[in-house]
């Protein structure tokens, strides 16, 4: 008689990614019986949500349930409902609370008290809602990248399954950038890392990591343009502000109000004599970047070496994964080859920042405004941050891979999370079976 | 477990400056701000504003803005508050607590005797 | 500024009995449907320990017998049954504007 396939004895889990300028649902999907297999788990949707980040909600927490509804009817779509009740259901929320929490406690809260009423609402396995720290970004978007990347394998490959991948067992190191804080996360080599706060210690199929992290909360790309126009309207205190990380002729009238009211711009804010002032762009990538290169304070350094802002840093080792902003910004410009070079990529940013705003609305007629006039920005700021803040060089640039997904899952810390969460990252390797367990009888 | 840990008794003369400090511990010291209180007389609290560790920002309570300045160092997780020109109205115990709005942990006091 | 006043300034209590303190504010401390209030108890020679927290939340580890109430302008603390343990000093505090303000503080002891 012919084979029959049997029902597909698989596990599904949904993480959403609760960032400071949007919500992303996923989807993960993985074989039964090979949890603790590495490289099994993938993503099969992602869904992003309509509208801003979760802690924008504070003064209308009565919209957040309609806000999450279309993901979480698509995910009850996606999932067969014979496996909704045993799909674990997780939310980390990321800079754009820890923000919100920095500022009341009791907002935060109760932002995530109706996120978790609303995911309770749905018939699958809620885990709870909660801030993730940033240390935990970092470290699960590490663990991600280097999981499918398969480098948790101990079988070593002939072949690679992904252009970039190098066939040995190194780790790739972790560069995460979003709105609200940005995340650096590497093995050093041979170097102890001098400060505690940064240094974390993983078994992973038997094998140990000593791992340096770092999150800057305030310096993802959104915060960090805040505390740009905060610094610069403290030295003009005129209520039009001729702005290099703009193009020529772009204008944009800016509240006081709203501009002062992250904690990122605290240090920058004063009394001013006007409640709006105009950004005026001039489009000038070399005064932007110098521009930029203001907020990281490089005068001060109590350990052997920093980052910024007296942040100890190691030396940079390996390839590096640059994944969300990093690589949307870049990938919009056009620069994710692995055969740019920094010095080409700075050439193009040249180029780009000093184009008309008009003929570059012209150019990229399909694209929102407000996303669109800040790439200039966010380009520059990449190279300033990557070069300045974690001193790549032009040669170590090549070792920076702009990555989107990987084998279909995308890049970023949610993977990480729901692989720790559901405990499929043994720290001892699986003995391995001599025969997997077939499908088809 | 979340800790703060002040800085040892002070007697200080009029017209004097006092500095004392917050060390903290058991959580990322730059995701949360750091608020110092005055309380005289074993009664009245009295609030004198806040840093923020993440990039040194602070706001204070008018009536000691100018005389108080709050500085942080985030690599040895520490708070500072720094009173000048002290006067005998200044002998009081100083807390530290960590908080946006809320004030679930206190350093156990810096005492300060503003005597002649 | 937001002036807390809280009543009475001290208060006896029976134990098993009931202890209501309350905390009048000038202007309201509620924003973005939280009431910014809490109370706090304070023993010699401790700092304050926070009780309650957006007017009704019981802050960490705390009794179930220390209960917050109220809304807008008006606020108050109820500890039933009284223990011998709960003699203290208790004071309120605002945090919805700069500068933040404490109550004058009640003064509880055993009847």
């Known amino acids: 008689t012919q084979n029959k396939a049997l029902p597909e004895n698989v596990k599904y889990g949904i993480v959403l990614d609760a960032g400071s300028s949007h919500t992303s649902l996923y989807i993960y999907k993985w074989p039964a019986e090979k949890e603790n297999d590495t490289g099994v788990v993938h993503q099969v949707e992602e869904c992003r949500v309509k509208g801003p980040g979760i802690s924008k909600f504070v003064q209308k927490v009565n919209e957040i349930g309609i806000y999450l509804t279309d993901c979480m009817e698509r995910a009850r779509e996606v999932i067969p409902r014979s496996q909704h009740q045993e799909t674990p259901v997780y939310l980390g929320a990321t800079a754009g609370m820890r923000l919100l929490r920095m500022e009341s406690e009791e907002l935060a809260d109760r932002v995530l008290d109706v996120v978790e009423r609303s995911l309770s609402n749905y018939p699958f396995d809620f885990q709870g809602a909660r801030i993730i720290t940033g240390q935990e970004e970092g470290a699960y978007g590490w663990i991600t990248i280097n999981y499918l990347l398969g480098k948790f394998s101990q079988k070593t490959r002939w072949f690679s399954i992904v252009p970039y991948e190098t066939n040995n067992q190194e780790t790739f190191g972790a560069l995460d950038l979003g709105g609200a804080s940005t995340q650096v996360t590497f093995v050093p080599q041979n170097q102890t890392i001098e400060s505690p706060d940064n240094a974390l210690q993983f078994r992973l199929y038997g094998k140990d990591y000593n791992v340096y992290t770092h999150s800057f909360l305030c310096y993802g790309k959104d915060q960090a343009l805040w505390q740009k126009l905060a610094k610069d309207i403290q030295v003009s205190s005129a209520e039009s502000l001729a702005d290099p990380c703009f193009h020529p002729g772009y204008k944009k009238v800016v509240n006081v109000s709203d501009l002062y009211k992250t904690p990122c711009t605290k240090r920058f804010e004063m009394t001013l004599p006007f409640q709006q002032f105009e950004i005026q762009g001039i489009g000038n990538y070399q005064q932007c970047h110098q521009s930029i290169l203001e907020l990281f304070n490089t005068s001060y350094c109590p350990y052997s070496q920093c980052a910024f802002n007296g942040i100890f840093l190691p030396p940079l080792q390996g390839d590096f994964g640059a994944f969300s902003a990093f690589y949307f910004v870049m990938k919009f410009l056009n620069l994710t080859s692995e055969k740019v070079s920094q010095e080409k990529v700075t050439e193009m940013m040249k180029k780009f920042c000093a184009q008309p705003w008009e003929e570059i609305k012209t150019s990229y007629a399909g694209v929102k405004e407000k996303y669109l006039s800040e790439y200039c920005f966010s380009g520059t700021y990449i190279l300033s941050l990557l070069l300045q803040g974690y001193h790549f060089t032009a040669d170590s640039w090549e070792h920076i891979h702009f990555i989107g997904k990987i084998q279909g899952s995308d890049a970023g810390w949610t993977l990480g999370y729901m692989l720790n969460l559901t405990n499929m990252i043994p720290a001892e390797q699986p003995l391995s079976t001599p025969l997997s367990h077939s499908t088809y009888v | 477990e979340v800790q703060l840990q002040q800085s040892g008794p002070e007697l200080v003369k009029p017209g004097a400056s006092v500095k004392m400090s917050c060390k903290a511990s058991?959580?990322?010291?730059?995701?949360?701000?750091m608020h110092w209180v005055k309380q005289s007389h074993g009664r009245t609290l009295e609030w004198i504003g806040y840093i923020v560790p993440l990039n040194g920002g602070s706001t204070f309570n008018q009536k000691f803005k100018g005389r108080a300045t709050l500085t942080v160092n985030t690599s040895s997780r520490t708070a500072y508050m720094e009173l000048r020109s002290l006067t005998s109205e200044d002998s009081a115990a100083y807390y530290c607590?960590?908080?946006?709005?809320?004030?679930?942990?206190w350093g156990q006091g810096t005492l300060v005797t503003v005597s002649a | 500024d937001i002036v807390l006043t809280q009543s009475p300034a001290s208060l006896a209590v029976s134990l098993g009995q009931r202890a209501t303190i309350s905390c009048r504010a000038s202007?309201?401390?509620?924003?973005?449907?939280?009431?910014?209030m809490y109370w706090f108890q304070q023993k010699p020679g401790q700092p304050p320990n926070l009780l309650i927290y957006g007017a009704s939340n019981q802050g960490s580890g705390v009794p179930a017998r220390f209960r917050g109430s109220g809304s807008g302008t008006d606020f108050s603390l109820n500890i039933h049954p009284m223990e011998a343990d709960d003699t203290a000093m208790y004071f309120c505090q605002q945090t919805k504007e700069v500068p933040y303000t404490f109550g004058g503080g009640t003064k509880l002891e055993i009847k």
């Open positions: 607590a960590r908080g946006g709005t809320r004030f679930a942990y």
């Open positions: 202007e309201s401390v509620d924003n973005f449907g939280v009431s910014f």
């Open positions: 058991g959580y990322t010291f730059t995701d949360y701000n």
